[in-house]
């Protein structure tokens, strides 16, 4: 077993058999509780200054006779650097100076080893290296400056804030780090406890109006505040916080201000402030009209800015009806504290005068718009309707009309530029432009800066102008063995007017073609017609081509018709009636053509 | 740094003996256990035994017992390995190496012993 | 005495790969938490280099692709990744009691 002499010991071990034993600086005196007194426990003094290295204690085996052939080898916490070994005689050393706040306590293992086969002679011990502390550490404050707010008028006695200051040494062990709190700037304002640090209003009546920033200076100083004690030092910036404790004043008791009539809804007119010594939402401020001739056409709105009243216009003025108006207004704070509400009512109010004055104004059109009607077979010089403007102004200035021609530049339209009545130039054709909008525009005689333009809505009426025609071009076939009355074809029309009932088509072969054809036209009398065979077979080497000239007419006023041709192939076909040849025989007989009569 | 010199070859006649050497320079002689170790090309490495300089304690593997005697001369911290009785079974390499905590930590570069008549 | 089986008796291994050795003691070379097992390499015409020494400790200067492992009586020694200078003879050797013994050797070869 590794041990020591009992007589080398600071106070003896208990007297239990160890592997391996250990003597030195274990003051054991210092934590002699029976229960947590530990037999491998060393203590060193922290930040040792001596010239050696400093001595910890020995470790020992009863297996070593002392020549040489065990060694003793040190691990863990700092072995081999902050503590050293000698290998031969177990003596421990540290070679550091040891600061307890950087590390209290170095766990270190032990072991002592045959040097000839590297045999642990016994099993390895643990053992505790724990600083003893000195007072070597100020109290540091957990911040350097700490800022705190408390409203403005706050009781004595009113809790601010906590500052704390820690300090590194040892609490477990004398005063060292033990902190007391005392105020060296800020009195009489603040007061802190001594033991917790907690500062507190000391004051009454501290009036944020009058004074706002505080700088209040915190010593906290250890071993309980006692002579020769270390401390440190904090600044605490302490702002009062503003209560609602003054109402709004106007600095004048009238304000007067003037708007054109021409003023539209929402515009402002101008402002008016009250003042508030307080700050924030104690210092803002509702504004409202409370009474006067203009309660309905003006309004009070509240910039969050600036906390100015915005007078602005709520209908729309005339000066021919109301030159001046007369407001009450109003400012309040909307946050009030019941407890200041003895100083006074938290509002006041000022009258405010508006004049209205007079604008030349552009002529007023009868309508907003105007939607006017024309047949497209209307002559030149059709008129198509009027319109009407007229000067607002009580001098009632003439008015003369014009087209805006950026918005009819083909010149199709024109006005009379006295009565405003409107009239075609050119032609028109529904079928181009079914709707043209223009603009008219209205100046006063007197004064041509003042114009107003209205929108002109000018539809194009339908006349039956165009002819229906094919939808598609036709060419079809019919197959040699085909039999009589059989459908080759469907036929469709199509027409570019657009009638009031809707297109009704009729199809039919022409005259010249009706007798003896070879095909029938069938008008199905729902705008198609159907191609039929008129007889039993065909022969493509007799005749391979047909041409069929079918009239097709519409049923408005005036009729229109045309006549479209409709190519008719004869084909040798299969017995499913799937073509199979329709044109090599067709270079053979170059004269077979016929119009199908 | 730490060397272990020995001579290179021995050749010897059967029923000899033979002294071989072993010189250390470069750490304290006395500190460190001085081993032995025979090598064959068929029987790999055998350790035959140690000494320890500063007592001249000794061991032996019990085989070598009788064969080999180990000894050191402090003054010129050299080691010595006599073998006795030499048969041709004694013809190996034999290298000297410093021992530390059960481990061969620096070796010399080996004597070559031949015996051969 | 305690005698040490290596195996296998050579193996050829890759370049990169890894390379394991065993060895088993007849009975057990640890006390006290401190396992006796040392690791040699030998290359021809050479005498033998300490690599490991008590079952997992690198001697000072030996690259870190070496290491070694185990308790009691098996313990195994790994290389990776192998490199060409690895070519030798590897043994493993005890102190745990008179006679110290070695391992019978593990020749490696590099493929």
């Known amino acids: 077993t590794l041990s020591t002499p009992l007589s080398k010991r600071t106070s003896g071990f208990p007297a239990k058999k160890r592997a391996l034993e250990l003597s030195g600086n274990s003051k054991n005196e210092l934590s002699r509780s029976k229960r947590s007194w530990m037999w491998n426990q060393f203590f060193l003094l922290e930040e040792y200054t001596g010239s050696d290295y400093q001595y910890v204690g020995k470790l020992h085996s009863d297996q070593d006779r002392g020549d040489g052939s065990l060694k003793y080898i040190l691990s863990g916490d700092g072995a081999g650097d902050l503590f050293i070994i000698n290998e031969n005689t177990g003596d421990i050393q540290a070679t550091k100076r040891l600061d307890r706040e950087e590390k209290p306590v170095y766990i270190l293992r032990a072991q002592a080893i045959n040097r000839r086969t590297g045999r642990p002679v016994e099993p390895e011990s643990e053992f505790i290296i724990k600083i003893h502390d000195i007072n070597d550490n100020e109290p540091i404050f957990t911040k350097e400056v700490y800022t705190a707010t408390v409203p403005e008028m706050s009781d004595v006695g009113t809790f601010v804030v906590q500052v704390t200051a820690t300090d590194a040494d040892d609490p477990t062990y004398g005063n060292s780090a033990k902190v007391v709190y005392s105020i060296l700037q800020g009195q009489p304002y603040f007061s802190v406890e001594s033991e917790t640090g907690i500062i507190k209003t000391a004051l009454l009546n501290m009036d944020r109006e009058n004074r706002e920033q505080y700088q209040v200076v915190i010593q906290a100083k250890d071993m309980g505040g006692q002579m020769g004690g270390l401390s440190g030092t904090t600044t605490v910036n302490i702002t009062l916080t503003d209560v609602n404790d003054n109402p709004p004043r106007f600095p004048q008791s009238t304000y007067q201000f003037k708007t054109p009539e021409s003023s539209p809804p929402g515009t402002p007119i101008g402002r008016i402030k009250a003042s508030d010594a307080d700050v924030g939402e104690n210092a803002e401020i509702e504004y409202s009209i409370t009474d006067g001739e203009g309660l309905d056409m003006f309004d009070v709105i509240t910039d969050q800015e600036t906390q100015e009243g915005i007078i602005t216009v709520k209908k729309l003025l005339d000066f021919e009806k109301k030159k001046v108006y007369t407001l009450k207004v109003e400012a309040s704070n909307p946050h009030v504290e019941p407890r200041f509400l003895y100083l006074g009512p938290f509002k006041d109010s000022a009258t405010v005068r508006i004049v209205v004055e007079d604008v030349d104004e552009p002529p007023v059109f009868s309508k907003l718009a105007y939607i006017l009607q024309i047949r497209e077979d209307a002559q030149i010089n059709t008129t198509i309707g009027s319109v009407t403007a007229q000067d607002p102004d009580a001098a009632r200035n003439p008015v003369k009309y014009s087209v805006d021609r950026h918005t009819d530049m083909d010149r199709i339209f024109n006005i009379d530029s006295g009565n405003g009545s409107i009239f075609t130039s050119k032609l028109l054709d529904r079928e181009t432009l079914l709707w043209h909008n223009i603009t008219v525009i209205a100046t006063e005689i007197n004064n041509p800066k003042q114009s107003s333009r209205v929108p002109l809505y000018i539809k194009v009426l339908d006349v039956n102008d165009n002819a229906p025609e094919f939808a598609e071009f036709y060419e079809t076939f019919v197959c040699e063995k085909a039999k009589a009355d059989q459908l080759i074809q469907t036929l469709r029309a199509v027409d570019k007017d657009d009638p009031y009932s809707g297109h009704q088509f009729s199809f039919s072969l022409a005259p010249e073609a009706a007798s003896g054809s070879n095909f029938t036209i069938q008008d199905n009398k729902d705008n198609t017609a159907g191609i039929l065979t008129r007889k039993n077979g065909y022969n493509r080497h007799e005749m391979s081509t047909y041409l069929l000239p079918v009239v097709i007419s519409d049923n408005d006023y005036p009729v229109q018709s045309s006549t479209g041709t409709v190519t008719v192939r004869v084909c040798a076909c299969d017995h499913h009636g799937n073509m199979q040849s329709c044109h090599a025989e067709a270079l053979i007989h170059p004269t077979g053509l016929s119009t199908g009569a | 740094q730490v060397q272990l010199q020995q001579p290179g070859a021995e050749l010897v006649r059967p029923g000899s003996s033979v002294k071989l050497s072993c010189k250390a320079s470069?750490?304290?002689?006395?500190?460190?256990?001085m081993h032995w170790v025979k090598q064959r090309p068929i029987e790999g490495l055998e350790w035959i035994g140690d000494?320890?300089?500063?007592?001249?304690?000794?061991h032996y593997t019990q085989k070598f017992k009788d064969k080999a005697t180990l000894t050191v001369d402090k003054s010129s911290s050299t080691a010595y390995m006599q073998l006795s009785s030499l048969t041709s079974e004694d013809s190996a390499v034999y290298y000297c190496?410093?021992?530390?905590?059960?481990?061969?930590?620096?070796w010399g570069q080996g004597t070559t012993l031949t015996v051969s008549s | 005495d305690i005698v040490l089986t290596q195996s296998p008796a050579s193996l050829a291994v890759s370049l990169g790969q890894r390379a394991t050795i065993s060895c088993r003691a007849s009975?057990?070379?640890?006390?006290?938490?401190?396992?006796?097992m040392h690791w040699y390499q030998q290359k021809s015409g050479q005498p033998p280099k300490l690599l490991i020494y008590?079952?997992?400790n690198l001697e000072s200067g030996v690259p870190a692709r070496f290491s070694g492992s185990g308790s009691e009586t098996d313990f195994t020694f790994n290389i990776h990744p192998v490199e060409e200078e690895d070519a030798a003879t590897y043994f493993c050797?005890?102190?745990?009691?008179?006679?110290?013994?070695f391992g019978g050797g593990t020749k490696l070869e590099i493929k």
């Open positions: 008590a079952a997992s």
């Open positions: 470069g750490y304290t002689f006395t500190n460190y256990w």
């Open positions: 190496a410093r021992g530390d905590l059960g481990r061969f930590d620096y």
């Open positions: 000494i320890d300089p500063s007592h001249s304690e000794t």
């Open positions: 009975e057990s070379v640890s006390i006290h938490g401190t396992h006796l």
């Open positions: 050797q005890q102190s745990f009691e008179d006679p110290w013994t």
